[in-house]
Interface confidence: medium
């Protein structure tokens, strides 16, 4: 029951996370204009991964897409790539995890297959979350660098033909959405990986056992060995009853008189 709950919760958390990553990628507010020290606040600029917008206090908004691909900064291209990879991996992970859910029965799918699929989707969610966090962090770093460069440029003189002052930009809403969404996807992935351990079927590993008659007074007691799950304490198939039964690992080093009967 706890395994099903962990798997289900992991799926829901990852679903919310991936929806957030998609939303953040599509949002225009990755960076917003810092209006500090600006004499005219009627025009408000903000940028996304795909287009740049200008909004006025009147409500008028104009957005233009970055139609050029080669002319864009390499870092912006890298952020786009990271976010898309995150979305693709997350989408595949969601598809795999739907079939892996313990509460959903698909034909005669064994628990081992569901466990493997749960682990696969969990890893995909983790990588997806990391891609989103990395993408958002790279963009945030671009902004911080741009902000401090701009701050330095604001105090330059009026010499020369044309003076350029970079408009300072700060973190937009999309960055926070991206960070939270990436974190949720990551948490969901971890939960799926934890659920995978509980889903792993109990393996019945009977090792070859040699029985040695140690005397007429001791009879063999059946059920002396437990099936190993791989997670229990009896992983070495240690003998439970000292009724003369021994595993291959415990064969006597010195032959007894009964060995040659």
């Amino acid at each position: 029951m706890a395994v099903t709950a962990c798997q289900g919760l992991g799926f829901v958390v990852s679903l919310i996370g991936i929806a957030g990553i998609i939303a953040a990628t599509c949002m225009d507010q990755w960076s917003t204009q810092d209006l500090y020290n600006n004499p005219v606040t009627a025009v408000f600029n903000y940028q996304g991964l795909w287009r740049s917008c200008v909004r006025e206090s009147s409500g008028f908004t104009e957005c233009r897409g970055y139609f050029t691909l080669l002319g864009l900064p390499a870092m912006l291209q890298a952020v786009r790539a990271l976010m898309i990879v995150g979305i693709v991996l997350g989408a595949i992970g969601l598809l795999v995890s739907i079939f892996a859910l313990k509460c959903i029965r698909i034909g005669s799918m064994e628990d081992s297959a569901k466990a493997n699929m749960t682990l696969t989707s969990g890893i995909m969610f983790i990588v997806s979350g990391l891609c989103a966090i990395a993408g958002v962090s790279v963009f945030a770093n671009m902004l911080v660098t741009n902000f401090w460069m701009s701050t330095a440029n604001m105090y330059t003189g009026m010499g020369g033909m044309v003076q350029t002052v970079q408009t300072r930009y700060t973190f937009g809403a999309a960055l926070f959405v991206g960070w939270v969404a990436g974190g949720l996807t990551l948490i969901g992935g971890v939960m799926m990986c934890i659920a995978c351990r509980g889903l792993a079927p109990e393996e019945t590993n009977y090792k070859a056992v040699s029985y040695h008659a140690s005397g007429h007074s001791v009879a063999y007691k059946p059920g002396g060995f437990k099936a190993s799950t791989g997670f229990g304490s009896n992983t070495k198939n240690k003998k439970i009853y000292d009724g003369g039964a021994r595993t291959e690992d415990e064969v006597q080093s010195y032959p007894s008189k009964h060995d040659y009967v």
Epitope: S31, V54, R64, L70
Partner: nanobody, 121 residues
């Protein structure tokens, strides 16, 4: 390289008119706000008028009703029509634009070199 070049300044009598132009040239992706500033000798630079991308205008109280700002988006040009000029309008007029260069992400603020307007009899 983006450049803002002002023209149209000169000597004019009080009550006269002048039309300033500011042409933005270079690889421009989008022009956002465009503004006219002025700086009189020994004074701080002040905002005269501004125009938004949709054409909404803002004016300093001292020039309202006398100056008109306009822009031609197809030519990337800003204009300032100055009527009923007074001696206190004497200053160097600067063109200012927030614009995004082609291949850029963020808008930068550009200034022209300035054009002198002298109102004297």
């Amino acid at each position: 390289q983006v450049q803002l070049v002002e023209s149209g300044g000169g000597l004019v009598q009080p009550g006269g008119s002048l039309r300033l132009s500011c042409a933005a040239s270079g690889s421009i992706f989008r022009i956002d706000g465009m503004h006219w500033y002025r700086q009189a000798p020994g004074k701080q630079r002040e905002l005269v008028a501004s125009i938004t991308p949709s054409g909404i205008t803002h004016y300093a109280d001292s020039v309202k009703g006398r100056f008109t700002i306009s822009r031609d988006n197809s030519k990337n040009t800003l204009y300032l029509q100055m009527n009923s000029l007074r001696a206190e309008d004497t200053a160097v007029y600067y063109c200012n634009a927030h614009l995004v260069k082609v291949g850029g992400v963020w808008s930068d603020e550009y200034w022209g070199q300035g054009t002198l307007v002298t109102v004297s009899s």
